[in-house]
């Protein structure tokens, strides 16, 4: 019977997981007299694959970041090898996992900040890729500061934007940094995929060196 | 005195998932990070990840993801680390170690515990 | 990952010799390596920090040296109580990774 795994030679868009082994068929099309075999072409990789008899699988897992659309073309033909339905197109659409981790593009960032900079202004940002998808919670990345050194007295003096890795000065630390006093800061940063939300997130650390330095404009005087 | 007083050593079947602590004393507890290290063989050190009590947030070393959890209690100035679905791979010395806070000495292990025997075995 | 190699693996001295211990890092690292001692079942020691700076209540005979990827942990005259394993430490990037390590022994 027909259903959804059979019937007529038709354009179709069929959307497989990456990464999955192959464990059932995607379709088996149903020739049509004269049509006795069917033939595939386009962009197979070796991985997709017709039998003469219709049956289309595929034959190892799908890497999304390798190609994320598989575009095919199925045709129907007679005993004589004579293509007498299609081509018809065929579309594979791989669906992304969570299959790579974030990472930095730098071991190590170095950035230097003014005393008394305005909170909030980024002075420095680190960059993290993802080879997932963008477009799903497997690649969006989340920026977090895991430590400040030194702690002094806990009041963190740098922040980070969560979402595009922008480091600037808290409130605090635009009204506390002070060269003389203390003249470096390292900052120990992860970034988390799946927007940083779940158990099963890929992550990476980067360091950042930061020096304060002095605010060499004066208020006038009276 | 900076003290880290582990927990006492485990005897576990394979699958199994123990927790060790590591309780600080002598200083204040949110103003360092806590690194975990795991010693197989009586040799080899290897860096499991680090804990900031002071906000929670972590570092893993990507080799122990799915292996090893961290965590802290403020209030009884402990941190926490959870093994999972353990293996004979897992058995080895474990220690917690606390950062020097200086940025100048970048992640030096200034103190560490005593450490935590984890022996897997059927 | 940075990966650190230390040599040699065994070093066996006579009580007063001046030793000198390697750490190479696969790639340069400035001055952020670390060494540790660690004697039969103790926990490890932080002797030198940032290459060369000693810590607080060790012997003067140990000193460091180094900076980019070769570092050198020097006793200028070894005792007996010295002997152990000793660790270096990338202290540059993450994750942290140590060398496998030299075990000083006495003839």
């Known amino acids: 019977q027909e259903g959804k795994f059979s019937g007529p030679l038709k354009p179709m868009t069929f959307s497989i997981y990456e990464g999955q082994e192959p464990s059932q068929i995607i379709f088996q099309f149903k020739a049509n007299p004269p049509a006795v075999t069917f033939e595939l072409t386009g962009e197979t990789d070796n991985i997709f694959v017709i039998e003469r008899e219709g049956l289309l699988y595929y034959n190892r897992a799908l890497d999304r970041e390798t190609r994320s659309t598989h575009n095919l073309q199925v045709a129907a033909l007679d005993a004589n090898g004579i293509i007498v339905e299609g081509p018809v197109p065929i579309t594979i659409k791989v669906k992304d996992i969570n299959d790579n981790r974030p990472t930095f593009l730098q071991s190590k960032y170095e950035g230097s900040v003014r005393q008394n900079s305005r909170p909030g202004k980024p002075f420095l940002y680190v960059n993290a890729t993802d080879l997932d998808d963008p477009a799903t919670p497997n690649g969006q990345l989340y920026y977090q500061i895991v430590i400040q050194l030194p702690m002094i007295n806990n009041v963190m003096y740098f922040q980070i934007n969560n979402k595009t890795g922008a480091i600037s000065l808290t409130r605090e630390g635009s009204q506390e940094l002070n060269p003389a006093k203390n003249p470096s800061y390292n900052l120990v940063i992860s970034v988390k995929d799946m927007g940083g939300q779940s158990e099963n997130s890929f992550s990476d650390t980067t360091s950042v060196d930061i020096i304060v330095t002095e605010n060499i404009w004066k208020a006038p005087k009276p | 005195e900076v003290q880290l007083q582990q927990s006492g050593p485990e005897l576990v079947k394979p699958g199994a998932s123990i927790k060790i602590s590591c309780k600080a004393s002598?200083?204040?507890?949110?103003?360092?990070?806590l690194n975990w290290v795991k010693q197989s063989h009586g040799k080899n050190l290897e860096w499991i990840g680090l804990i900031n009590p002071y906000n929670g947030g972590t570092s893993y070393n990507q080799k122990f993801k799915g292996k090893a959890t961290l965590t802290v209690d403020k209030s009884s100035s402990t941190a926490y680390m959870e093994l999972l679905s353990l293996t004979s791979e897992d058995s080895a010395v474990y220690y917690c170690?606390?950062?020097?806070?200086?940025?100048?000495?970048?992640?030096?292990?200034?103190?560490w515990g005593q450490g935590t025997s984890v022996t897997v075995s059927s | 990952d940075i990966v650190m190699t230390q040599s040699p693996a065994t070093l066996s001295v006579t009580p007063g010799d001046r030793v000198s211990l390697s750490c190479r890092a696969s790639?340069?690292?400035?001055?952020?390596l670390h060494w540790y001692q660690q004697k039969s079942h103790e926990s490890p020691r932080l002797l030198i920090k940032?290459?060369?700076q000693s810590m607080s209540g060790i012997p003067s005979r140990f000193s460091g040296s180094g900076s980019g990827s070769d570092f050198i942990l020097s006793i200028n005259s070894v005792e007996p109580e010295d002997v152990g394993m000793y660790y270096c430490?990338?202290?540059?990037?993450?994750?942290?990774?140590f060398g496998g390590g030299t075990k000083l022994e006495i003839k």
């Open positions: 002598g200083y204040s507890f949110t103003g360092y990070a």
């Open positions: 940032s290459g060369s």
């Open positions: 430490q990338n202290g540059h990037s993450f994750p942290l990774t």
């Open positions: 790639q340069s690292i400035s001055d952020y």
């Open positions: 170690a606390r950062w020097d806070g200086n940025p100048h000495y970048y992640y030096a292990m200034d103190y």
